[in-house]
């Protein structure tokens, strides 16, 4: 009786079982009763990630270098080219086709995590008793200063974008 | 038990044809692929021909191909090639083969071809 | 076309001893591979399939391995009834070829 499945890694034609090519390779001719899949090797420039019955191989993605893009690992014939962006610039999907720059976390905000060549700045709103007075990709809510330990006293108040005025004690007559 | 018995050869002169035969017995023929190999007297293994289960699919090697035919009958369990065109080169001992599991997993004894003036 | 060179062409080797034939591809045919045994005035009978592939009925002292290009056909200790000529066959892609044989003869 002819077949109506196959093991994993085959697939059935003209009622018969073939083996699928292996990653990495292409299919040329599919199986007889007297010969196997024929598969040959994708090109150099070329890939297949799976066991497939693919007649051409997917070229591997080109990082454009206009786009922002460069390569993070070169493809090889059973894998796709990984691109990332260059610095200051990461991507706008998940598939990373094109690059944007990151963002800066505003007056007020602080960098919880700092951009990636795949993820852009994740600002936080600066809590009570920290402060940011600048525009800044890099740089987290920094801590009010502590007018305390310095033997000051607090002159002026301060926010979430500015940093507590010390003053000098008023001394007693 | 699986036999192969194959009939038809002989003395044939250069550019004259000749039909081979091959009955089959005890196996369902039609279920499968099926192959003629030749052997020139002292020499090794030639592939000359293939037929799928059907029939519907023949296969030759580029220095039979235009010249030889293989067919088959499977109400009669019997397969068969045609040679035509023959020549000197073609003197061997041409052997029918079962394809089970892609090998040749039975073979006949065999019928030798002599091609000679 | 894929060619098969089998070597050596002769072996000769005492009964008892291990046998070791070799079959060698002129392209990778992954373990597309058949070994076939020929006695004087006999048909060719099936010995081992895909390279490895024991056949039932077939002494355990045959075995086969290789994949790629490189193949050997090895029996363990030869018996007097193993004297004869071995093929190797591939059916990666037509044409089928086979190779040119290796003699095993008594020394």
């Known amino acids: 009786e002819p077949p109506t499945a196959c093991r994993e890694k085959q697939y059935l034609i003209n009622s018969q079982c073939c083996s699928l090519c292996q990653p990495g390779q292409k299919l040329v001719s599919d199986c007889t009763e007297f010969t196997e899949t024929e598969c040959l090797p994708c090109s150099e420039s070329e890939f297949l990630d799976t066991w497939n019955r693919e007649t051409r191989c997917h070229q591997h993605k080109y990082c454009d270098p206009n786009l922002g893009l460069q390569v993070q690992q070169k493809g090889t014939s059973e894998t796709d080219t990984i691109c990332t962006c260059e610095e200051g610039l990461h991507c706008t999907s998940e598939s990373c086709e094109s690059c944007v720059p990151h963002r800066s976390c505003l007056p007020g905000f602080g960098v919880k995590q700092i951009a990636t060549g795949v993820s852009d700045t994740i600002c936080e709103p600066c809590p009570v008793g920290f402060f940011s007075n600048v525009s800044s990709a890099f740089e987290k809510c920094r801590p009010w200063t502590s007018c305390e330990t310095k033997d000051l006293v607090v002159q002026q108040a301060g926010t979430n974008k500015t940093d507590v005025v010390c003053g000098p004690q008023d001394r007693q007559r | 038990e699986v036999q192969l018995v194959e009939s038809g050869g002989g003395v044939v002169q250069p550019g004259r044809s000749l039909r081979l035969s091959c009955a089959a017995s005890g196996f369902t023929f039609s279920n499968y692929g099926m192959s003629w190999v030749r052997q020139a007297p002292g020499k090794g293994l030639e592939w000359v021909a293939s037929?799928?289960?059907?029939?519907?699919?023949?296969y030759y090697p580029d220095n039979v191909k235009g010249r030889f035919t293989i067919s088959r009958d499977n109400s009669k369990n019997t397969l068969y090639l045609q040679m035509n065109s023959l020549r000197a080169e073609d003197t061997a001992v041409y052997y029918c083969?079962?394809?089970?599991?892609?090998?040749?997993?039975?073979w006949g004894q065999g019928t030798l071809v002599t091609v000679s003036s | 076309e894929i060619v098969l060179t089998q070597s050596p062409a002769t072996l000769s080797l005492s009964p008892g001893e291990r046998a070791t034939l070799s079959c060698r591809a002129s392209q990778s045919i992954r373990d597309n591979l058949h070994w076939y045994q020929q006695k004087p005035g006999q048909a060719p009978r099936l010995l081992i399939y895909y390279a490895s592939q024991s056949i039932s009925g077939i002494p355990a002292r045959f075995s086969g391995s290789g994949s790629g290009t490189d193949f050997t056909l090895t029996i363990s200790s030869l018996e007097p009834e193993d004297f004869a000529v071995y093929y190797c066959q591939q059916f990666n892609s037509w044409p089928l070829t086979f190779g040119q044989g290796t003699k095993v003869e008594i020394k």
């Open positions: 083969t079962r394809a089970g599991g892609k090998a040749m997993d039975y």
């Open positions: 037929i799928s289960s059907g029939g519907d699919d023949t």
